[in-house]
Each structure stands twice: as structure tokens, then as C-alpha cells.
């Protein structure tokens, strides 16, 4: 089978601090040494890029300094964390994996993780 399969959880609930974590696992049809992982957000059939990182197999994922994503990798598994989420960011987050090097190139796209974000209630003022 030449197509690459990507698995990710169907649903994740963000923490009260607006942090959501999920695992993105891919079945590699080739022996890639350089992999690119992209998180996409799909809302109303529009797809936008949330963050992306390219890493060497065996090394850590490095997102840009200003990225809202962090992650670690272990074999064909990537642990992704998205920070700074608010209720309006609730949506479908798709894990896209590309085996970049050596050729041939392979693309794998997960079915998406529905991330639910609930803004915390503001603390009531205390009267003493």
C-alpha cells in the first residue's frame, strides 16, 4: 500500500487555561529522515494553517518562536500541544504529515480532531 495513513483522536477538550494536546500518528510507507507536520484548522469548509514544523527523525520538533504550537516526536508519533485557545477557536484541527526526504514524497492527512474550548468564568470580586 503506497498511501500514508494518519490517525488522530476524534475529540479533545482544551484545559481551562486554553491548552489542548493530542497525538498524531502516521504509518510511514517509506523510510523518511525528514518529516513535516502541519496543523490545519477547518471551519465552514475554509482551511487555514495553524502551525508547522519540519524535523529530522530522532530529533525534536521545532516550531517557530512565535508559534502557538509545541510538540515532541517519538518514532512515527507526534505529540502536539496548542496553546492560547479561546472559545472562538473551537473547531476541527487536522494533522497533516509530509515525508519530505528522501524522495519519494508522501502526504498523509488525518480526519481531524474536534477541539472544544470553553472560556473560564471570570472570578467574582470578593467582598471582605
Amino acid at each position: 500500500c503506497k498511501a500514508m495513513h494518519v490517525a488522530q483522536p476524534a475529540v479533545v477538550l482544551a484545559s481551562s487555561r486554553g491548552i489542548a494536546s493530542f497525538v498524531c500518528e502516521y504509518a510511514s510507507p517509506g523510510k523518511a529522515t525528514e518529516v513535516r507536520v502541519t496543523v490545519l484548522r477547518q471551519a465552514d469548509s475554509q482551511v487555514t494553517e495553524v502551525c508547522a514544523a519540519t524535523y529530522m527523525m530522532g530529533n525534536e520538533l521545532t516550531f517557530l518562536d512565535d508559534s502557538i504550537c509545541t510538540g515532541t516526536s517519538s518514532g512515527n508519533q507526534v505529540n502536539l500541544t496548542i496553546q492560547g485557545l479561546r472559545a472562538m477557536d473551537t473547531g476541527l484541527y487536522i494533522c497533516k504529515v509530509e515525508l519530505m526526504y528522501p524522495p519519494p514524497y508522501y502526504l498523509g492527512i488525518g480526519n481531524g480532531t474536534q477541539i472544544y474550548v470553553i472560556d473560564p468564568e471570570p472570578c467574582p470580586d470578593s467582598d471582605f
Epitope: 500514508m4 494553517e49 519540519t54 519530505m100 526526504y101 514524497y105 502526504l107 498523509g108 492527512i109
Partner: antibody, heavy 118, light 107 residues
């Protein structure tokens, strides 16, 4: 408006060279992988080459490997195809195409015709 | 290299009819399959990606289905502007390959 405009096509003798350009506008060019696809007269579509957003990764069809070189200049929002050792079978309309976030080729230029003949 | 087969090469319909085109891959491409429309003298236009998702601005009379090796593209009710050549393409691995195309012409 999202747009790709190719240029540089023309008539060239077998063994000759040509450089195609593709000018992008209306989107953040540096964020997208790009492709060249060709179509011989009366025939179907054939993928030629692909280049990643930062030029780090490049792929070629076997039919052009060693003869064609893809490149890009993100500062100029431009994609290029340097074609050397041209053959009659390279005669085609050459299209540049953007790779969409989900993988397919979502935006295409109008094409530029390359004719290789003596 | 993954080979895509489209059959037949030409299909003839009258406006208003339903058109169903097929594309078969030599090995599994999962759902990494797109459909393009091309009219004479024009560039291809993306219609369907991911086997069944419509591209932005594409009318809902166009639809796609299938996964693995067998795919179907359907135009529910042919409009005069739909008579063109339709190509399938796999984009899951390089080299990215296209089918030979199916021409939909007027009966």
C-alpha cells in the same frame, strides 16, 4: 485576486535551453509549495516538478530529471523552470500550479507554450 | 509510479442529464484524489479534492466519491458549460500522476 502568470515560452531547437517564469500575486507565495505541469498538444496532463515553500525540497519526474531545474525567489514572488537539453517530446504548454493546504493543485496559471523543433 | 485509468475516453450526454465518470488507481491512493475540469485553451480547474470535498466556489452539482483504488465523479445535471475534459489526479505520493482524461461532449 489570486493569480499565476507564466512567461518565457517560445520556439527552441533540440538540445537548446529555455527558462520559464511564473509570477504569483494575491497570496503569500512564500507559504506554498509550487509545481510545474505540462500538456503536450492534444494530450493529457503530466506533472514535471515540485518545490517546497522554502526551496528545501525538490522533486522531478523521471522524464526531466537531470535536464530541468526548478527554483523560486520568494522575495520576487516568482517560480522558475530552467530547461536544458530540450527534446521534441518536451513540446507542450507548461503550467505553474500552487499546492493547496490539503494537497491538490488549487490554483493554475494560464500556461506558456514551449515548442522544440529544428 | 501510480497509474490512473479513466474510462471511457469520451462520454456523450444531453444537457440536463446525469454524468458519471470513473477513475481507477493501480494501487491505493487512500483519499488523496482530485478531479479537474479543463476546457479548450484554458488551464485545468480544481473541482474535487480528498475524493469527495468540493473546492471553493464549485457548484454542488459536482460530487466525488470512492477511496483506495476506485473513484467516481458525478455531475448531477449537466449544464452547457460543463462539457469539457475531466482529469483525475493522485497527490498522495510523488510522482504525482494524472489520468488520461475523459471528454464529456454533447450528444
Amino acid at each position: 485576486e489570486v493569480q499565476l502568470v507564466e512567461s518565457g515560452g517560445g520556439l527552441v531547437k533540440p538540445g537548446g535551453s529555455l527558462r520559464l517564469s511564473c509570477a504569483a500575486s494575491g497570496f503569500t507565495f512564500s507559504s506554498y509549495s509550487m509545481n510545474w505541469v505540462r500538456q503536450a498538444p492534444g494530450k493529457g496532463l503530466e506533472w514535471v516538478s515540485s518545490i517546497s515553500s522554502s526551496s528545501s525540497y525538490i522533486y522531478y519526474a523521471d522524464s526531466v530529471k537531470g535536464r530541468f531545474t526548478i527554483s523560486r525567489d520568494n522575495a520576487k514572488n516568482s517560480l522558475y523552470l530552467q530547461m536544458n537539453s530540450l527534446r521534441a517530446e518536451d513540446t507542450a504548454v507548461y503550467y505553474c500550479a500552487r499546492v493547496g493546504l490539503m494537497g491538490p493543485f488549487d490554483i493554475w496559471g494560464q500556461g506558456t507554450m514551449v515548442t522544440v523543433s529544428s | 509510479e501510480i497509474v490512473l485509468t479513466q474510462s471511457p475516453a469520451t462520454l456523450s450526454f444531453s444537457p440536463g442529464e446525469r454524468a458519471t465518470l470513473s477513475c481507477r488507481a493501480s494501487q491505493s491512493v487512500s483519499s488523496y484524489l482530485a478531479w479537474y475540469q479543463q476546457k479548450p485553451g484554458q488551464a485545468p480547474r480544481l473541482l474535487i479534492y480528498g475524493a469527495s470535498s468540493r473546492a471553493t466556489g464549485i457548484p454542488d452539482r459536482f460530487s466525488g466519491s470512492g477511496s483506495g483504488t476506485d473513484f467516481t465523479f458525478t455531475i448531477s445535471r449537466l449544464e452547457p458549460e460543463d462539457f469539457a475534459v475531466y482529469y483525475c489526479q493522485q497527490y498522495g505520493s510523488s510522482p504525482f500522476t494524472f489520468g488520461p482524461g475523459t471528454k464529456v461532449d454533447i450528444k
